[in-house]
């Protein structure tokens, strides 16, 4: 990707329906710079076209450098209101920024994933709940729409609804993070 990212390094089951999640603190607990690829090892790339960024899912030529994304991880309190026991779980949420001032955002109306320029504090649409999966993959669940995940559809990123009772291992919502 042509633009450089100004990275400010800090020293430092599904979302229940109707749950309220408050991001604790405005600073991420940690950040990392990583390339993003699909379960099938296709790369997620970003290209500036007509003054806006497009997101592609593609096979990269061997010599082509993978685009990096700044992942900022936030803790959010997860009140255990269902059981009434008051136990606060921690939900790990992430924002993804492939270039300075641009963040991946969920467009729930269009079922799409878009890159938008925005200022902090970031909108809820830019936050995704991080899930561990098998094969050292992760999934990204929309904070604003529990049960909806970033996925791959027709060589693009899209929002994909996953049934709560289904196996969340479906390949199209699995991603690999690589810091190398």
């Amino acid at each position: 990707m042509g633009s450089s990212h100004h990275h400010h390094h800090h020293s430092s089951g599904l979302v229940p329906r109707g749950s309220h999640m408050s991001i604790t603190g405005i600073s991420p607990i940690t950040e990392s710079l990583a390339s993003l690829s699909t379960y099938n090892d296709q790369s997620i790339t970003f290209a500036l076209e007509d003054e806006s960024y497009e997101i592609y899912v593609e096979d990269l030529k061997k010599d082509k450098k993978k685009d990096k994304v700044l992942l900022s991880y936030y803790e959010s309190q997860h009140p255990s209101s269902e059981s009434g026991d008051g136990v606060d779980g921690k939900m790990l949420m992430v924002t993804l920024s492939p270039t300075k001032d641009f963040w991946l955002q969920a467009n729930n109306k269009e079922h799409s994933v878009e890159l938008h320029k925005c200022e902090k504090p970031l909108p809820d649409q830019a936050f995704f709940v991080l899930h561990n999966r098998s094969f050292n993959c992760v999934s990204f669940e929309c904070k604003t729409d529990p049960g909806v995940f970033i996925g791959v559809k027709d060589n693009h990123l899209a929002l994909i609804k996953v049934d709560y009772s289904e196996n969340l291992g479906s390949e199209n919502i699995l991603f690999k993070l690589s810091e190398t």
Epitope: V15, P16, G89, L92, N136
Partner: antibody
Framework: EVQLVESGGGLVQPGGSLRLSCAAS????????MSWVRQAPGKGLEWVSS????????NYADSVKGRFTISRDNSKNTLFLEMNSLRAEDTAVYYC???????????????WGQGTLVTVSS | DIQMTQSPSSVSASVGDRVTITCRAS??????LAWYQQKPGKAPKLLIY???SLQSGVPSRFSGSGSGTYFTLTISSLQPEDFATYYC?????????FGGGTKVEIK
């Protein structure tokens, strides 16, 4: 108060089987990744297996892959570890552990059971 | 698999001492490292997560730092209840792996 209580340990011959259970209470069990971690007598900690909140994703240590199966019954707030083809080197205290993060193991394990001893010997 | 190497394997110290334990990962793990304390016959207790975040209820004399491959756990002023074995654990990728442990003993 969060409680994790393991059961099912005991003495078993090499090649035998055991099923460990972990009864959970005090938190919304189905929301959390759960794991098994073991500790051989006088040794360090070894992660065994993890399972996602809905049971859809599982991960295993290479040393137990194909022999152990992790599962959960969210209606009964119970975690299981089915252990087959047991070997002497599986002898350990087995701990059930709750992830600090609801949907991820990235934050470590904040609650552990008291452990149940599995002894594999002839 | 990611190997976690802890040092020292044991340390003798007195109440009030500052104790530092190090943990090295065989490859980068970002900040996905946890520290645990274990006393004989008991289950481990989470002290630090995400390399430097103090777990709720843990005294502030415990602190963690580091990222990538090098991490430290520091006890600023050792208390009698701190004599125990300490383990680091990488949480970056499966299989999750622990360091070999550091036993903090009374001098």
């Amino acid at each position: 108060e969060v409680q994790l209580v393991e059961s099912g340990g005991g003495l078993v011959q090499p090649g035998g089987s055991l099923r460990l259970s972990c009864a959970a209470s005090g938190f919304t069990f189905s929301s959390y990744v759960m794991s098994w971690v073991r500790q051989a007598p006088g040794k360090g900690l070894e992660w065994v297996s993890s399972i996602s909140g809905n049971g859809g994703s599982t991960n295993y240590a290479d040393s137990v892959k194909g022999r152990f199966t992790i599962s959960r019954d969210n209606s009964k707030n119970t975690l299981f570890l089915e252990m087959n083809s047991l070997r002497a080197e599986d002898t350990a205290v087995y701990y059930c552990a709750k992830s600090l993060g609801t949907t991820t193991t990235f934050l470590g394990f904040d609650y552990w059971g008291q452990g149940t001893l599995v002894t594999v010997s002839s | 698999d990611i190997q976690m190497t802890q040092s020292p394997s044991s340390v003798s110290a007195s109440v009030g001492d500052r104790v530092t334990i190090t943990c090295r990962a065989s490859q980068g793990i970002s900040s996905w490292l946890a520290w645990y304390q274990q006393k004989p016959g008991k289950a481990p207790k989470l002290l630090i997560y995400a390399a430097s975040s103090l777990q709720s209820g843990v005294p502030s004399r415990f602190s963690g730092s580091g990222s990538g491959t090098y991490f430290t756990l520091t006890i600023s002023s050792l208390q009698p209840e701190d004599f125990a074995t300490y383990y680091c654990q990488q949480a970056n990728s499966f299989p999750l792996t622990f360091g070999g442990g550091t036993k903090v003993e009374i001098k």
